[in-house]
Interface confidence: medium
């Protein structure tokens, strides 16, 4: 049923207004059931196929073959105590283009997410001869000309304007209905630019001969990757271990990364270097760096970028 | 890998008949309405037939229509070209095409030649 | 018969912009494509619906259509860019039409 009490159509077009106690009044088919019309100066002026010959009473339904500029106002279907209201404005059609701006859909697709347009008019599917699906106004090759269906996953080169555009015949006359999508395709927004957490730059006490694990974390999408660089040649320290990586997924779903860098055996070869750590994703990299000094001289070291 | 294979050209007298055939491979074949395009030698492209998906629509340039039928077989993933009555100006490269629903003519073949000469 | 008429041919130095124009009655109602040939090969896509450039199409290759012409530009227009280009209508639903191809010389 027509739910809605505040409606807009395009003038020209083919229109219906259905109560919502349909199932009701077929159970008391002798109760009088009316359909009122008030605009401006007129006050609930009741319809009847006399009243114009655009429009058509049926026992749940109210129909405009079509509807034009001067249907706008209040309609008003009353039965027994029940009644129901509705306020239709009917906007002129563009006349330069295949639809009218103010009778757009919008909708949001992802890049590389499913979209789909389907062309369906399920009141009147029986007398619709045949259904066009145009985007920008130009007609798409389409096989199904009776509900035209794009399924596929989206490009960015699929936004625009899609029009679904039915035609049918009624009482010997052409009509058309127009149902119009502003399709917008956006980036993946469930990506997230990957970032490292703490500081960026690390200074890191310790003694020689020992052992130390640098522990590198960061937040990042499940494709990104998290790697270590050090020396001139990653590897030729064989004191220097890079651990399995460890992931675990957010509510999110996003992941919680995890890189240990071991060094064993600390010598000076290892102090004063740069060890840098790494996550790369499409959108970019971020690195932050950790340095060894020996316990020693950290007296030297200001307070806020000592890590232990 | 996607990909179209045309073969059955040839050399062919005026009046005379060929059958081309074009082998479709890495997709849904019964999902793309497919098309034949001719080059004529030193020449553009000629759109000579296409034809949809389901093969319940077929379309024709002016200068074959009667004596061309496109044709398309979706188990076999083939799509046929049946040429009679031909003239001198139907030598060309025939290519077959891929013809997607937004408009793309994607995917083409390698071309086979048709010479028609006595 | 419809016809879209194109330039036989269009000449342009290297990292200039050549355009291409394809005219025809109403062209900027129907859907244009532009096919881009090198001798001996088939052709390529290299612009959609206008304007839509297909994946591994470089960015400098750009088109419109409006009223009765559909215009292919080339921007920084490089050596590898010397082909013959042919642009294609959409006439009514499987039927198709093409130019007469242009040829593009890089001096």
């Known amino acids: 049923c027509t739910s809605r009490p505040h409606i807009t159509v395009v003038e020209g077009e083919p229109f219906y207004l259905k109560h919502c106690s349909c199932s009701l009044a077929h159970e008391i088919e002798t109760t009088t059931k009316s359909w009122y019309k008030s605009s401006g100066s007129q006050e609930h002026v009741e319809l009847n196929p006399r009243s114009s010959s655009r429009i058509a009473l049926h026992d749940c339904v109210l129909e405009f073959w079509p509807v034009e500029l001067n249907d706008t106002g209040s309609y008003f279907f009353q039965m027994k105590n029940y009644t129901q209201k509705w306020k239709l404005n009917v906007i002129r059609r563009n006349k330069h283009s295949c639809f009218t701006e103010r009778q757009v859909t919008s909708k949001i697709v992802e890049v590389k997410k499913f979209f789909q347009i389907t062309c369906e008019n399920s009141y009147y599917q029986t007398l619709v001869n045949s259904t066009s699906l145009y985007k920008n106004c130009k007609k798409l090759l389409l096989e199904n000309n009776k509900n035209p269906t794009i399924k596929k996953n989206a490009e960015f080169e699929d936004q625009g304007y899609y029009s679904c555009v039915h035609f049918l015949h009624h009482n010997g006359k052409l009509f058309n209905i127009t149902k119009t999508f502003n399709i917008t395709i956006v980036e993946d927004r469930s990506n997230i630019v990957p970032v490292l957490l703490g500081p960026k730059l690390n200074h890191v006490a310790v003694e020689l001969g020992k052992n130390v694990r640098l522990n590198c974390s960061a937040l990042l999408n499940e494709e990104d990757v998290i790697y270590w660089m050090f020396g001139e040649e990653n590897g030729s320290d064989p004191n220097i271990h890079e651990e399995k990586e460890m992931r675990i997924m957010t509510p999110e779903g996003k992941w919680h990364a995890s890189k240990v860098l071991r060094i064993e055996n600390i010598g000076e070869s290892n102090l004063n270097v740069l060890y840098n750590c790494t996550v790369a994703s499409t959108g970019g990299t971020d690195t932050k760096s950790f340095i060894l000094v020996r316990k020693a001289d950290m007296a030297d070291i200001p307070g806020h970028v000592f890590t232990r | 890998e996607v990909q179209l294979l045309e073969s059955g050209g040839g050399l062919v007298q005026p009046g005379g008949s060929l059958r081309l055939s074009c082998a479709a491979s890495?997709?849904?074949?019964?999902?793309?309405?497919m098309s034949w395009v001719r080059q004529a030698p030193g020449k553009g492209l000629e759109w000579v037939s296409a034809?949809?998906?389901?093969?319940?629509?077929?379309y024709y340039a002016d200068s074959v229509k009667g004596r061309f039928t496109i044709s398309r077989d979706n188990s076999k993933n083939t799509l046929y070209l049946q040429m009679n009555s031909l003239r001198a100006e139907d030598t060309a490269v025939y290519y077959c095409a891929r013809i997607r629903g937004d408009y793309r003519t994607d995917i083409w073949g390698q071309g086979t030649t048709v010479t028609v000469s006595s | 018969q419809p016809v879209l008429t194109q330039p036989p041919s269009v000449s342009v130095s290297p990292g200039q912009t050549a355009s291409i124009t394809c005219s025809g009655d109403?062209?900027?109602?129907?859907?244009a494509s532009w096919y881009q040939q090198k001798p001996g090969q088939s052709p390529v896509l290299v612009i959609y619906?206008?304007?839509n450039r297909p994946s591994g199409i470089p960015e400098r290759f750009s088109g419109s259509n409006s009223g009765d012409t559909a215009t292919l530009t080339i921007s920084g227009t490089q050596a590898r860019d010397e082909a013959d280009y042919y642009c294609?209508?959409?006439?009514?639903?499987?039927?198709?039409?093409f130019g007469g191809g242009t040829k593009v010389t890089v001096l």
């Open positions: 619906q206008d304007s």
């Open positions: 890495g997709f849904t074949f019964s999902s793309y309405a």
């Open positions: 109403k062209l900027g109602d129907k859907y």
């Open positions: 294609q209508a959409w006439t009514h639903s499987l039927s198709t039409l």
């Open positions: 034809i949809s998906g389901s093969g319940g629509g077929t």
